[in-house]
Interface confidence: medium
């Protein structure tokens, strides 16, 4: 009893690992929310309507002292930083199109703005944030950026943005409806990091009693089992799957979209965080506000053959 058996050592190692994961998850990821662009390319015929969408991922605080600034603008693909240039969309600046609201609210730009310019930006309480453009023309082609700023108290702003391309086509080569191309798998992995961290937190909390019980029972059983049994059980333990979590479909889809198949994304690994200052001390903007829930989007990795949807 003095020396731990192989199973005891293995189960404690497994238990410790899960417990460490739980602790890390409970403390929460350092990075806050991220922005996902479910589709990186929209190809539409002239005259069609399209809704470009961004989604908030990860833990979004809905407290009374947290507000969101969200907006859209056109940009160009900079060599260093995409979305650095802020150009108007149909003569409306990012200030004109911005939403500014609490984390628990939905919001949209006023109706007269939409009617006058064929534009409307909207945000729902599920983290979806979109701009609808009506009666597309060739001039609408270009890079579009969504910007989201989480504003906490007076001294903290956290800014993230997403980019997508719109190609408006005319003539016989143009599609009859808009076709959307999901973001690449690498992009998907990057933007789901926040969702995975949140998922790990939830799973950790839910599984903690189970883990502790499992470890305790296995420890008890281990002292009464033979070496052959230990080896067999140890190999079984190695086969335990990591607890998974379902990806919820978007609550508010693209109005004009007819999705042919549900998009699903299984994360193979959790990539390291990279990119823009995610948690900031204080900050000020050339940008936007909106709301959001903790939201796990379903995203599709792009396989070797082009993967697209008609919308």
């Amino acid at each position: 009893m003095g020396v731990p058996t192989a199973l005891e050592a293995g189960s404690w190692r497994w238990g410790s690992l899960l417990f460490a994961l739980f602790l890390a998850a409970s403390l929460g990821p350092v990075a806050a929310f991220k922005v996902a662009t479910p589709y990186s390319l929209y190809v539409c015929p002239e005259g069609q309507n399209v809704t470009l969408t961004c989604r908030l991922l990860g833990p979004v605080d809905k407290g009374h002292d947290v507000t969101f600034y969200k907006t859209w603008y056109r940009s160009s693909r900079g060599e260093v930083q995409t979305c650095s240039e802020r150009r108007p969309i149909r003569n409306l600046t990012f200030q004109d199109l911005h939403l500014h609201h609490g984390g628990h609210q939905a919001a949209n730009t006023s109706h007269d703005l939409a009617q006058r310019h064929g534009l409307e930006s909207a945000s729902d309480h599920h983290g979806n944030f979109s701009i609808t453009m009506r009666n597309l023309t060739l001039l609408d082609s270009g890079l579009y950026c969504c910007l989201v700023v989480e504003i906490r108290h007076h001294h903290s702003e956290h800014r993230v943005h997403g980019a997508m391309e719109l190609q408006v086509q005319t003539g016989k080569d143009a599609p009859s409806n808009c076709v959307v191309y999901p973001s690449s798998s690498q992009d998907s992995e990057n933007i789901t990091a926040a969702a995975l961290a949140t998922g790990a937190c939830i799973v950790g909390i839910l599984c903690l009693p189970l883990i502790l019980l499992l470890v305790y029972k296995q420890r008890q059983a281990a002292s009464n089992r033979r070496a052959q049994e230990l080896v067999r059980m140890d190999s079984n333990i190695q086969g335990i799957e990591n607890p998974g979590f379902e990806a919820s479909p978007p609550a508010q889809g693209i109005p004009e979209a007819k999705v042919r198949h549900p998009l699903s994304y299984v994360a193979q690994r959790q990539p390291s965080e990279s990119g823009r200052h995610l948690l900031s001390e204080p900050s000020t903007p050339l940008s936007p506000p909106g709301p959001g829930d903790v939201f796990f989007p379903s995203l599709d990795p792009v396989p070797d053959s082009p993967n697209f949807e008609v919308i």
């Epitope: 507000t67 600034y69 900079g78 930083q81 979305c83 650095s84 240039e85 802020r86 600046t93 200030q95 004109d96 199109l97 911005h98 939403l99 500014h100 609201h101 919001a107 949209n108 730009t109 006023s110 703005l113 700023v149 504003i151 108290h153 007076h154 001294h155 702003e157 956290h158 800014r159 823009r276 200052h277 900031s280 001390e281 204080p282 900050s283 000020t284 903007p285 050339l286 940008s287 506000p289």
Partner: antibody
Framework: QVQLQQSGAELVRPGASVTLSCKAS????????MHWVKQTPVHGLEWIGA????????AYNQKFKGKATLTADKSSSTAYMELRSLTSEDSAVYYC????????????WGQGTSVTVSS | DVVMTHTPLSLPVSLGDQASISCRSS???????????LHWYLQKPGQSPKLLIY???NRFSGVPDRFSGSGSGTDFTLKISRVEAEDLGLYFC?????????FGGGTKLEIK
Amino acid sequence: QVQLQQSGAELVRPGASVTLSCKASGYTFTDYEMHWVKQTPVHGLEWIGAIDPETGGTAYNQKFKGKATLTADKSSSTAYMELRSLTSEDSAVYYCTRWSLRPYAMDYWGQGTSVTVSS
Amino acid sequence: DVVMTHTPLSLPVSLGDQASISCRSSQSLVHNNGNTYLHWYLQKPGQSPKLLIYKVSNRFSGVPDRFSGSGSGTDFTLKISRVEAEDLGLYFCSQSTHVPWTFGGGTKLEIK
């Protein structure tokens, strides 16, 4: 606490250029836009433009396009404004201000830099 | 550009009195998203402006509760319930609904 430290007063000749600096401290420089404001007794306060220090993206008041150029150095948390082809109309106090989204306003201001254009 | 107009240009008061400063904009400051981005600043002699009130009626951090803002559309008011010596200076209204952001010429609060 948030502080914006601006460079000292400038006396410059007409036609010349001048670069004003604004060093930020007490917050994460790249998280907030830096805006610049001109103040004269005649025209009061006028918004010149803004820069996003993270991306280098800028926005200008049409009135100051061609007159002012905004830049930022992330490594030193310093914003710069170059004023060129100076005339007596450009004599003013220039403020750098931090723009914050919650108030959607300029929440902290530098102490100002006085620029005098005189031959 | 949106023009911001103050009344009065000068307001002599006695310490302890209530002061009321008005600001009118040349067009509505209600943004497409429903918010009204009208702010008040105080500039004391020889100092830079300081934010007092944002979005019509919200006091910025550290601002005493004797300051209050109200109004809608194009007409706005800043009230100081009991004027103290440290309140003297130039009060500006400012809008950030329409680009370019613009400021009023200011109201000078001085001792009667």
